[in-house]
């Protein structure tokens, strides 16, 4: 499955929106920094299968959508930017949905994919628990925004690699 060029553009637009959503200086939140353990190995271009990567992308975007569509999130960010962000994520989910289904039909996920999906899910569990532990403070949201930007940047680069391999 070839991810459309629009998907890459959508990913870049989502990154730009995430950057624009920043409200407070990252430097004022250094004490709140946390290593969420982004599951880089899941997206490792040397050993991943394409279907695995696409399933993991989908899970990542779905979890990002859920994370940013909570009441606590709505209170933390500019509503207009948040709505635009939702639209970009929704479009990416649509692109990836078609790909996930095309890669292996709607058959059961292979063992390798199971582990990659679980790794992404656990990553977002750590983010969720961090936010709850910090009582959804502005600095906690800023740390999470920066983290999601990093993970999106990583997956954007990998998707370029995916298209080159095709």
């Amino acid at each position: 499955c070839d991810l459309p060029q629009t998907h890459s553009l959508g990913n870049r637009r989502a990154l730009i929106l995430l950057a624009q959503m920043g409200r407070i200086s990252h430097f004022s939140c250094l004490k709140d920094r946390y290593d969420f353990g982004f599951p880089q190995e899941v997206f490792d271009g040397n050993q991943f299968q394409k279907a695995q990567a696409i399933s993991a992308f989908h899970e990542m975007i779905q979890q990002t959508f859920n994370l940013f569509s909570t009441k606590d999130s709505s209170a933390a960010w500019d509503e207009t930017l948040l709505d635009k962000f939702y639209i970009e994520l929704f479009q990416q989910l649509n692109d990836l949905e078609a790909c996930v289904t095309q890669e292996v039909g709607v058959e059961e996920i292979a063992l390798m994919n199971e582990d990659s999906i679980l790794a992404v899910r656990k990553y977002f569990q750590r983010i969720t628990l961090y936010l709850m532990g910090k009582k959804y403070s502005p600095c906690a949201w800023e740390v999470v925004r920066a983290e999601i930007m990093r993970s999106f940047s990583f997956s954007t680069n990998l998707q370029k690699g995916l298209r080159r391999k095709d």
Epitope: Q62, L96, T101, V106, I109, K122, F124, R126, T128, L129
Partner: antibody, heavy 119, light 108 residues
Framework: QVQLVQSGAEVKKPGASVKVSCKAS????????MHWVRQAPGQGLEWMGE????????IYNENFKSRVTMTRDTSTSTVYMELSSLRSEDTAVYYC????????????WGQGTLVTVSS | EIVLTQSPATLSLSPGERATLSCSAG???????LYWYQQKPGQAPRLLIY???NLASGIPARFSGSGSGTDFTLTISSLEPEDFAVYYC?????????FGQGTKLEIK
């Protein structure tokens, strides 16, 4: 509010198949994986597998892999769990439970569907 | 498969007493993915505690959870009549997700 409503009780003969439905409401159906858990009479809970309603992909417990099929219908926000080659040991209450993260993991359950397998 | 073993199988106590329920995992479980559920006859399970020690919404403070690695505990500080039920620990640290066989908390 989140609601999961399951289909009614079923009585099946050994060797037959059963298809249980779970209709979701109160949230974006395609955003959360749906799980199936069963409970034999007087027994504990057993995880059967999960389906992502967004693209329909499934992850099954090896114990059920050859006999279970999970599907979804996004137009009606409904997931289905079909179990084939039924035997008496499959007599159980079957639950759907919504995935999520943190306090949302299995925070919402269907009311359960009793499937009785008897000759 | 991570096997979760709960003990005791049945615990007979009186209202007002303290209940301690154990859950032992066959291999290490990250505390973030260890949950506890309560089930009453004819009802679906109800989430009590998530990520080992966090109280789910609407759950009274008499319930608490602790533990790490392979040993986890659910404690009810002072039993109320409505607490008599079956309790299950559950892990989603690795596939297949598993539940303990349950501890039945009954009135003495």
């Amino acid at each position: 509010q989140v609601q999961l409503v399951q289909s009614g009780a079923e009585v099946k003969k050994p060797g037959a198949s059963v298809k249980v439905s779970c209709k979701a409401s109160g949230y974006t159906f395609t955003n959360y994986w749906m799980h199936w858990v069963r409970q034999a009479p007087g027994q504990g809970l057993e995880w059967m597998g999960e389906i992502n309603p967004s693209h329909g992909r499934t992850i099954y417990n090896e114990n059920f892999k050859s006999r279970v099929t999970m599907t979804r219908d996004t137009s009606t926000s409904t997931v289905y769990m079909e179990l084939s080659s039924l035997r008496s040991e499959d007599t159980a209450v079957y639950y759907c439970a919504r995935g999520g993260l943190g306090p949302a993991w299995f925070a919402y359950w269907g009311q359960g569907t009793l499937v009785t397998v008897s000759s | 498969e991570i096997v979760l073993t709960q003990s005791p199988a049945t615990l007979s106590l009186s209202p007002g007493e303290r209940a301690t329920l154990s859950c032992s995992a066959g291999s290490s479980v990250d505390s973030s993915y260890l949950y506890w559920y309560q089930q009453k006859p004819g009802q679906a399970p109800r989430l009590l505690i998530y990520s080992t020690s966090n109280l789910a919404s609407g759950i009274p403070a008499r319930f608490s959870g602790s533990g790490s690695g392979t040993d986890f505990t659910l404690t009810i500080s002072s039993l109320e009549p409505e607490d008599f039920a079956v309790y299950y620990c559950h892990q989603w640290s690795s596939y297949p997700f598993t539940f303990g066989q349950g501890t039945k908390l009954e009135i003495k």
